[in-house]
């Protein structure tokens, strides 16, 4: 069964500043990516970024850089103040369209007791819905 | 299928200067990697310069600092700022995009061709 794994990271150098890396561990190929916040994309989350592997990347603020690390897994930094910044208990979405699997979707958010420049590792996260 | 097209090749005087440009079909989407090729009259194509979208720019050693690459304000146009031009930099000039980074899809634009002679 194909898995959605989420990290969130904050950064030590730049509290404001979050680096999101997300994952999908399946035999597929990935056709589309969506990174988003405050929930699951389409259920009350707004989107940061898409990324597609044959036409490219488009992301919005407080997204400053979205990118793919491997044909499987990408990571967005993202850095903002005010309104547009993201706090310690925000949640991130990610969510893999493959096929033939179909649309894998997990959240993560940053671990409680995590120090600024620390991160929970990369294991995967509840899946949260598979279309 | 993302689409490129080259403009702004001639005829020059060494010394002199061009500028290429480049338009891609894609406007939604980032291209993430695009950047400047070139292959001379029977030598294999090279890389001349990429930029990324986040503005990361490499270029081959024997262009730096007389050429220059930008990525202008219309989503994934391109641009190449040639000057001081040789005799060795006659070529035909390919604009090319990786809208991932990880070379799973690569396309080129049809060319334009750079002479560079008295």
């Known amino acids: 069964t194909p898995e959605v794994w989420v990290q969130v990271r904050m950064e030590a150098t730049e509290l404001s500043s979050f680096t999101i890396r997300c994952g999908f561990l399946g035999s597929g190929s990935i056709s589309l990516v969506t990174v988003s916040w405050g929930g699951p994309n389409g259920a009350g989350g707004t989107t940061l970024a898409v990324l597609h592997p044959e036409r490219g990347i488009r992301q919005w603020a407080p997204a400053r850089q979205a990118r793919w690390e491997t044909q499987s897994s990408i990571s967005l930094i993202l850095e903002g103040s005010g309104a547009s910044s993201p706090c310690a208990n925000t949640t991130f979405c990610c969510k893999f369209a493959s096929f033939p699997e179909g649309s894998w979707e997990a959240c993560g958010s940053l671990p409680p007791s995590s120090d600024p420049g620390l991160s929970a590792p990369p294991t995967p996260a509840p899946i949260l819905r598979a279309d | 299928e993302v689409q490129l097209v080259e403009s702004g090749g001639g005829l020059v005087q060494p010394g002199g200067s061009l500028r290429l440009s480049c338009a891609a079909s894609?406007?939604?989407?980032?291209?993430?990697?695009m950047g400047w090729y070139r292959q001379a009259p029977g030598k294999d194509r090279e890389l001349v310069a990429t930029?990324?979208?986040?503005?990361?720019?490499k270029y081959v050693d024997s262009v730096k600092g007389r050429f220059t690459i930008s990525r202008g304000d219309a989503k994934n146009s391109l641009y190449l700022q040639m000057n001081s031009l040789r005799a060795e930099d006659t070529a035909v000039y390919y604009c090319?995009?990786?809208?991932?980074?990880?070379?799973?899809?690569?396309?080129w634009g049809q060319g334009t061709m750079v002479t560079v002679s008295s």
């Open positions: 930029i990324t979208y986040t503005g990361s720019i």
């Open positions: 090319n995009a990786d809208p991932s980074g990880l070379g799973r899809k690569v396309y």
């Open positions: 894609e406007t939604y989407f980032d291209l993430y990697v």
